[in-house]
């Protein structure tokens, strides 16, 4: 169909800062240290290519990537198709976050990434430590009291947790823009549901207890017509596409080399096991440490606590896809009525999980709406 991919895009070997400057945008790179010692790279695009002269404070927009991904998700397409560049050109101060364990957040003050201890985290810790540290840093650096938060996939999950459990952090969020939101995954069609009955001991036995590599577990589900086509062989061995699903019709196939070289960006086996627990329970709750005794040590209760999104009063706008395997429309349907301050919702019938970051028509379907909503907020 597309033949073998030849790495034609220079961004294949670039880091985040290089990708930003390659397209002629200003870039600032910072290191944020979390309370538990993780060092997260944060990038800033303070203005666009044509509006550097505009003085005065620009509204701050913080973009948080999803599962198995990194900040490169927001800058992997051409500038007119990448949300980070679109926002910068629209006059906003754009910040890109990274979650612990990914390519750009794989250091810790106390633990080496070679140690099991480094990888003992799930999305709980991303919400409890990574988001507050990054948002506090941005607030201090910009001198602005509030920012706009854009999350995709797990980036929405950690937003739901952080903004419903940490009221002082929630006050810092002007609006939450949720793309392919994930709270419960009761109805997910993603291949992670194949893992839901694998006990923890076997899960660790198969995948290890550090960084998550898909191993050969998923091969048995991929021998389909879809995966036998030439171009898709490359996608079928990639954990991000395996877990999230894909639809080549909406991709700019000339950018596939960039997507594949930067993804999966890495997460912990514990995080992936947390997601399988969520599929099995159908609930939105903290990591289950495997026994009442261990749960008591972590939570002072025998069962992991539930996350209550009804406690999140941040204004939220939601976009979801009708063909999304991970953020299934039925799960989104359960989520929406629980959001006390839902200001906008749009379901895009033909969108899948990754279309929100990479689809060729994402500006028309999603990004332009975000830009206008932020500019309305300015008034």
């Amino acid at each position: 169909l597309f033949g073998k991919l030849h790495p034609g895009s220079p961004e294949v070997t670039m880091n985040i800062s290089q990708m930003i400057t390659y397209w002629g945008y200003p870039n600032e790179e910072y290191e944020v240290v979390t309370e538990d010692g993780y060092i997260l790279e944060v990038n800033r695009i303070p203005y666009g290519k044509k509006n550097s002269g505009n003085t005065g404070q620009r509204p701050v927009v913080f973009l948080q990537h999803g599962l198995l991904a990194s900040a490169t998700n927001w800058i992997s397409n051409l500038p007119n198709n990448s949300l980070a560049f679109i926002l910068a050109d629209a006059g906003y101060d754009v910040w890109l976050g990274n979650s612990r364990g990914n390519t750009w957040a794989r250091r810790n003050l106390y633990y080496s990434p070679d140690s099991v201890e480094f990888w003992a985290f799930s999305f709980d810790e991303m919400a409890k430590y990574d988001l507050p540290a990054t948002i506090d840093f941005i607030v201090k650096k910009t001198g602005q009291k509030q920012l706009h938060y854009v999350g995709h996939s797990q980036g929405t999950t950690i937003g739901f947790i952080a903004f419903s459990t940490n009221p002082s952090l929630a006050k810092r969020i002007k609006t939450f823009y949720a793309l392919a939101p994930v709270a419960t995954v009761k109805y997910t069609k993603s291949l992670i549901n194949k893992l839901r009955f694998v006990p923890q001991s076997l899960f660790k036995f198969i995948f290890g207890d550090k960084i998550f590599y898909p191993h050969n577990f998923f091969d048995q589900f991929l021998a389909t017509e879809v995966c036998s086509r030439e171009m898709l062989n490359l996608l079928c061995s990639n954990a991000l596409f395996i877990i999230c699903g894909f639809d080549s019709k909406n991709f700019n196939t000339s950018r596939l080399d960039v997507y594949l070289s930067h993804n999966p960006a890495g997460t912990s086996v514990q995080n992936m096991f947390h997601w399988t627990q969520a599929v099995k329970s159908g609930k939105f709750q903290a990591y289950d440490w495997g026994s009442p005794v261990q749960n008591r040590m972590h939570y002072d209760q025998s069962q992991p606590p539930y996350y209550n999104v009804t406690a999140m009063n941040v204004p939220i706008a939601v976009w979801n896809g009708g063909k999304d395997l991970l953020a299934d429309p039925q799960d989104v349907g359960l989520l929406l009525p629980k959001l006390p301050n839902l200001i906008y919702h749009k379901e895009i019938p033909f969108y899948n999980h990754l279309d929100f970051i990479w689809a060729m028509d994402a500006p028309q379907e999603v990004y332009n709406d975000i830009v206008s909503m932020i500019s309305e907020d300015k008034k």
Epitope: F197, L202, D219
Partner: nanobody
């Protein structure tokens, strides 16, 4: 509900071999993972060999190169070939299967390796 039943355990001398079988009441072809666990005296049950539906295998370091996991989908049976047995291999061996409907355990079979 798939029922699993192990057989082939027993008493064997160090250096000897055993072949454990795990017969399933239903199809094992639909199992995503078939695995063998060992519970050594006074210890927790832990996985020692796993076989994915794709055919790929994983072994615990302690058995690597000595044990081989396999399955015969037509006979709905999984096997564990154990060679060069040592007293440390003594314990109850359980077979398990994980599929779309759940995770299933056998009752276990005792293996004792004497020195």
């Amino acid at each position: 509900q798939v029922q699993l039943q192990e057989s082939g355990g027993g008493l064997v001398q160090a250096g000897g071999s055993l072949r454990l079988s795990c017969a399933a009441s239903g199809s094992i072809g639909s199992m995503y993972v078939m695995s063998w666990y060992r519970q050594a005296p006074g210890k927790e049950r832990e996985p020692i060999a796993a076989l994915m539906g794709s055919g790929s295998t994983t072994y615990a370091d302690s058995v690597k190169g000595r044990f081989t996991i396999s399955r015969d989908n037509e006979k709905n049976t999984m096997y564990l070939q154990m060679n060069s047995l040592t007293p440390e291999d003594t314990g109850v061996y359980y077979c398990a299967g994980t599929g779309a409907e759940g995770h299933y355990w056998g009752q276990g079979t005792q293996v004792t390796v004497s020195s």
